[in-house]
């Protein structure tokens, strides 16, 4: 429908303005511009958005007006290229403006920065925020969209509208409350944490599409939707996969207006056809649009249909396996993936994709053999080790998590990953290992049947963060290899890495281990990050240090911080005791 609908409009910009409404149109254009030009001041973006909006209104009034027939990429690209400081601020990105569409848009996309050099967002006092909210609600909410979009250039735009709606609701409610802070701060913390998770999940979808292609994304979508909607027929799942792929291709490609419009259409279709999709959609479908789309995306798995037959009948025992495969390879593999996934909500999507890949490889080999059936008869036996590997890994790591707690579990992962890939920057190792460590509290509480999909699919999201950050400044061939060889085998690839024996230990620098009284005023989280940064640096200096040695040094360090933060003259304590700690640590580690 989307493709035909587009052809029917003389003016694409007018069409999207009418479909989305002025408020959403302006918000989405702001997000698009902020995701492309991440360093531009807020006011500059607002000015550009207002100009585009005024132009769109002229096209709504008369679709034949000058320039109204231009593509959105042409209109938006022309607008971005009017920015006066483009060369000074963005350097070679300015060269994009010399190109024609579609190359110009591709050029802008390639310059999106996953780790832009922007100051950390500091949360003002609650009263200050409430005053700003009341003074100019529209500007306050636009600023939110702008700040999130520029820091997360792949954030799923229609979902960011949903976050902004919740952000507004939090301020509307809490700025009238008796205890504003008690009401607002937990809500803002929740939005921040959910926002980071949402951004990371979407970043994996975009990486999947951009680095591994549409087929890889569609395979992921078949597996996930089949788990979620096991009662839906293959044809229905295939239709949803096609539509969902279009939505995410658009958003990942910067086509945010089309993406939001098509996402709304998809939610509408799902709700109109929920009888043939899932029994779990009723509540979602009663909500307003943004909430509805979010709810559908997060909806729990439906119950499996009764009496599903053995998979072997269709995919191993049938005399027509090679005939069916040869007739339409991807369709037959899609059927296999659908049938396997709907029976296994207890498997991670990446495991299901590994099984499908194994099945495909077997058919490729066996259907060319003298006796195909004899050759592929035992294919399901090859699945056993693939299933057991993540099961065992999750069991071991959940036991370790339960034994250590989150902070110390993160530290164990910090040591493990620093030894695997010591060339990676310390901030990246800390960020990624902390996130890997969160898998414990997120997933280990679940029963066995829910642990693997929770844990392994979450790890895929976190390892993708490592991959995109590393791609910006590649320093490790091992990281590049694990990130690029196979999307579904990234986690097993990283798990299989041993200590990097080729690594030359970092020179010892006392400054790295010098701490000051300001550590005492940091939040618990910030203090943990400081200690974890020191731990990574220790391992980079002494990669062969044992767990026991590192634990002893870290315990001494924790005691040192605690002691000096209680001292009357904190700064003197940090200076004097710090020297002693560095000397003792060097001795303990044989530095």
């Amino acid at each position: 429908r989307g493709v035909f609908r587009r052809d029917a409009h003389k003016s694409e910009v007018a069409h999207r303005f009418k479909d989305l409404g002025e408020e959403n149109f302006k918000a989405l254009v702001l997000i698009a511009f902020a995701q492309y030009l991440q360093q531009c001041p807020f006011e500059d973006h607002v000015k550009l958005v207002n100009e585009v909006t005024e132009f769109a209104k002229t096209c709504v009034a008369d679709e034949s007006a000058e320039n109204c027939d231009k593509s959105l990429h042409t209109l938006f690209g022309d607008k971005l290229c009017t920015v006066a400081t483009l060369r000074e601020t963005y350097g070679e990105m300015a060269d994009c403006c010399a190109k024609q569409e579609p190359e110009r848009n591709e050029c802008f996309l390639q310059h999106k920065d996953d780790n832009p050099n922007l100051p950390r967002l500091v949360r003002p006092e609650v009263d200050v925020m409430c005053t700003a909210f009341h003074d100019n609600e529209e500007t306050f909410l636009k600023k939110y969209l702008y700040e999130i979009a520029r820091r997360h250039p792949y954030f799923y735009a229609p979902e960011l509208l949903f976050f902004a709606k919740r952000y507004k609701a939090a301020f509307t409610e809490c700025c009238q409350a008796a205890d504003k802070a008690a009401c607002l701060l937990p809500k803002l913390d929740e939005l921040r944490d959910e926002g980071k998770a949402s951004s990371a999940k979407q970043r994996l979808k975009c990486a999947s599409l951009q680095k591994f292609g549409e087929r890889a994304f569609k395979a992921w979508a078949v597996a996930r939707l089949s788990q979620r909607f096991p009662k839906a027929e293959f044809a229905e799942v295939s239709k949803l996969v096609t539509d969902l792929t279009k939505v995410h291709t658009e958003c990942c490609h910067g086509d945010l207006l089309e993406c939001a419009d098509d996402r709304a259409d998809l939610a509408k279709y799902i709700c109109e056809n929920q009888d043939s999709i899932s029994s779990k959609l009723k509540e979602c479908c009663e909500k307003p649009l943004l909430e509805k789309s979010h709810c559908i995306a997060e909806v729990e798995n439906d119950e499996m249909p009764a009496d599903l037959p053995s998979l072997a009948a269709d995919f191993v025992e049938s005399k027509d396996v090679c005939k069916n495969y040869a007739e339409a390879k991807d369709v037959f593999l899609g059927m296999f993936l659908y049938e396997y996934a709907r029976r296994h909500p207890d498997y991670s999507v990446v495991l299901l994709l590994r099984l499908a890949k194994t099945y495909e490889t077997t058919l490729e080999k066996c259907c060319a053999a003298a006796d195909p059936h004899e050759c592929y008869a035992k294919v399901f036996d090859e699945f056993k080790p693939l299933v057991e590997e993540p099961q065992n890994l999750i069991k071991q790591n959940c036991e370790l998590f339960e034994q250590l707690g989150e902070y110390k579990f993160q530290n164990a992962l910090l040591v493990r990953y620093t030894k695997k890939v010591p060339q990676v920057s310390t901030p990246t190792l800390v960020e990624v290992s902390r996130n890997l460590g969160k898998v414990g509290s997120k997933c280990c509480k679940h029963p066995e049947a829910k642990r693997m999909p929770c844990a392994e699919d979450y790890l895929s999201v976190v390892l993708n963060q490592l991959c995109v950050l590393h791609e910006k400044t590649p320093v490790s061939d091992r990281v590049t290899k694990c990130c690029t060889e196979s999307l579904v085998n990234r986690r097993p690839c990283f798990s299989a890495l041993e200590v990097d024996e080729t690594y030359v230990p970092k020179e010892f620098n006392a400054e790295t281990f010098t701490f000051h009284a300001d550590i005492c005023t940091l939040s618990e989280k910030e203090r943990q990050i400081k200690k974890q940064t020191a731990l990574v640096e220790l391992v980079k200096h002494k990669p062969k240090a044992t767990k026991e040695q590192l634990k002893a040094v870290m315990d001494d360090f924790a005691a040192f911080v605690e002691k000096c933060c209680k001292a009357d003259d904190k700064e003197t304590c940090f200076a004097e005791e710090g020297k002693k700690l560095v000397a003792a640590s060097q001795a303990a580690l044989g530095l």
Partner: nanobody
Framework: EVQLQESGGGLVEPGGSLRLSCVAS????????MSWVRQAPGKGLEWVSS????????SYADSVKGRFTMSRDNAKNTLYLQLNSLKSEDTAMYYC???????????LGQGTLVTVSS
């Protein structure tokens, strides 16, 4: 437009056999599991059997297990139900429907009547 055209019903004595057919059009037949349901005079719809998309996997109601056999020919967009050892309680209007073990109402064709009587 989805169309399902059943045929092959008739009058048969107890212990006898029939082969029902259902020709599908208006959708990609091989992308759907298919089922047979029946409705005895004055009764509600009863699920009879289902078959997977590829045709290797089947499931049957206890009341027909061992007597009925379901199959499909994807090249001909046709579904079959072989009815053996028929009993008077098998008398019903038989319909083919899209989907596995349908537990939600689905549009029915005109059906084919099976009457088992001596």
């Amino acid at each position: 437009e989805v169309q399902l055209q059943e045929s092959g019903g008739g009058l048969v004595e107890p212990g006898g056999s029939l082969r029902l057919s259902c020709v599908a059009s208006g959708f990609t037949f091989q992308h759907y599991a298919m089922s047979w349901v029946r409705q005895a005079p004055g009764k509600g719809l009863e699920w009879v059997s289902s078959i997977s998309m590829v045709g290797g996997g089947t499931s049957y109601a206890d009341s027909v297990k061992g007597r009925f056999t379901m199959s499909r020919d994807n090249a001909k967009n046709t579904l079959y139900l072989q009815l053996n050892s028929l009993k008077s309680e098998d008398t019903a209007m038989y319909y083919c429907v899209r989907g596995w073990h349908p537990d939600v109402p689905r549009p029915l064709g005109q059906g084919t009547l099976v009457t088992v009587s001596s």
